[in-house]
């Protein structure tokens, strides 16, 4: 005969564990139901009654099956240097990512605590290493025969155009100027751009004391421009 299905709460057989989506309550010494994502345990189980679950209050969440007495507080509202890529719901935390042109200067468990603007390389310097979602741009001086005349977080050093007759020689921050006769070879006039990083998602997971219901703001403060490194500008 098939074993009879036990309904929660029930006492587990010695040495056995509770089933999926159940937990062992030490006080009741019974296997009891967990609460589904988006809920929390309002009343813990007893020997005769199962867990009573309730929906998470405003601005709080639970992502997993659980028996926590309170849902976790959603993270603060995204700051002005961030975009909200996932809203706070009963089942998931808010996720904030750095907006284009910024990178994550201080990461946290999942995502970013503090965004900072990507460094811009000043004229005479080009991007040696592009910014990523978690690292700043690295600038380098333009080597002989190359130049950059922009203040940019994406432009690299470009070769000078080659002239039949040079009117003004190029330098690190300026292209060569040819005489009226056309140059033998000219690089494409447009600046060379490197792709912007795509930010990852971030998430807060701290409970708040007695959460009621809630919207969200941010403890994240926009950081001022990074101090200029050689060949960079905070503009």
């Amino acid at each position: 005969l098939p074993a009879q299905v036990a309904f929660t709460p029930y006492a587990p057989e010695p040495g056995s564990t509770c089933r999926l989506r159940e937990y062992y309550d030490q006080t009741a010494q019974m296997c009891c139901s967990k609460c589904s994502p988006g809920q929390h345990a309002k009343v813990f189980c007893t020997k005769t009654s199962d867990t009573v679950c309730d929906s998470c209050e405003d601005s709080t969440y639970t992502q997993l099956w659980n028996w926590v007495p309170e849902c976790l507080s959603c993270g603060s509202r995204c700051s002005s240097d961030q975009v909200e890529t996932q809203a706070c719901t009963r089942e998931q935390n808010r996720i904030c990512t750095c907006r284009p042109g910024w990178y994550c200067a201080l990461s946290k468990q999942e995502g970013c605590r503090l965004c900072a603007p990507l460094r811009k390389c000043r004229p005479g310097f080009g991007v040696a290493r592009p910014g990523t979602e978690t690292s700043d741009v690295v600038c380098k001086p333009c080597a002989p025969g190359t130049f950059s005349n922009t203040t940019s977080s994406t432009d690299i050093c470009r070769p000078h155009q080659i002239c039949n007759v040079v009117a003004i020689p190029g330098n690190a921050s300026m292209d060569a100027v040819c005489t009226s006769t056309s140059p033998t070879r000219s690089m494409a006039p447009g600046a060379v751009h490197l792709p912007q990083p795509v930010s990852t998602r971030s998430q807060h997971t701290q409970p708040t004391p007695e959460p009621s219901t809630a919207p969200s703001t941010s403890f994240l403060l926009p950081m001022g421009p990074s101090p200029p490194a050689e060949g960079s500008t905070g503009d």
Partner: antibody, heavy 120, light 108 residues
Framework: QVQLVQSGSELKKPGASVKVSCKAS????????MHWVRQAPGQGLEWMGR????????KHDPKFQDKAVLSSDTSVSTAYLQISSLKAEDTAVYYC?????????????WGQGTLVTVSS | DIQMTQSPSSLSASVGDRVTITCTAS???????LHWYQQKPGKAPKLWIY???NLPSGVPSRFSGSGSGTDFTLTISSLQPEDFATYYC?????????FGQGTKVEIK
């Protein structure tokens, strides 16, 4: 754009009841709470209660538990406040206001208010 | 219930003055759950500062908010004619959610 439009002013006799409506437009009713706040003449703001239109779950200030009934009809995007056993001290402007889930209760849009006058 | 006490209840100030309104909670309130509203006579309140220190779009940058625990402040760095109104703090930390009694900012 987001709008909350409330029903017009009411003049009621003591002991009567009144039902104030608040029609929402310009947003999804699913992830918001609708609050009711009252303001007696020359007085401050007083939170009465809140409804989750998606589930119908309500929460009241205990002071208004037996006085105010909150309801909503999602098919017409409207929340309702019914006040029973009206007394002269219930004379006030009643506001509906919404707070999006996840915004820690910040009421970002308000109705224009409904004046309820209780007088014999 | 958490009582919210604002001070002063009213104040008279001149255009250009720096104005500070304080809000004291009877027990600790998480900063995310503390908001300020502005109300002008005959009009509905407007959300003015959310979660202690954040300005909704359209609110001038001369307004700022700060505080934690039980003490919160709203500051106007340089009072303008359109700022004369009543300001209410509001806690959403623990139900029943409560407002301060309001601070009326009047023209001197």
């Amino acid at each position: 754009q987001v709008q909350l439009v409330q029903s017009g002013s009411e003049l009621k006799k003591p002991g009567a009841s009144v039902k104030v409506s608040c029609k929402a437009s310009g947003f999804n009713n699913k992830d918001i709470y609708m609050h009711w706040v009252r303001q007696a003449p020359g007085q401050g703001l007083e939170w009465m209660g809140r409804i989750d239109p998606a589930t119908g779950n309500t929460k009241h200030d205990p002071k208004f538990q037996d006085k105010a009934v909150l309801s909503s009809d999602t098919s017409v995007s409207t929340a309702y406040l019914q006040i029973s056993s009206l007394k002269a001290e219930d004379t006030a402007v009643y506001y509906c206001a919404r707070s999006p889930y996840g915004d820690f209760g910040a009421m970002d849009y308000w109705g224009q208010g409904t004046l309820v006058t209780v007088s014999s | 219930d958490i009582q919210m006490t604002q001070s002063p209840s009213s104040l008279s100030a001149s255009v250009g003055d720096r104005v500070t309104i304080t809000c004291t909670a009877s027990s600790s309130v998480s900063s995310n759950y503390l908001h300020w509203y502005q109300q002008k006579p005959g009009k509905a309140p407007k959300l003015w500062i959310y979660s202690t220190s954040n300005l909704p779009s359209g609110v001038p940058s001369r307004f700022s908010g700060s505080g934690s625990g039980t003490d919160f402040t709203l500051t106007i760095s340089s009072l303008q004619p359109e700022d004369f109104a009543t300001y209410y703090c509001h806690q959403y930390h623990r139900s029943p959610w409560t407002f301060g009694q309001g601070t009326k900012v009047e023209i001197k």
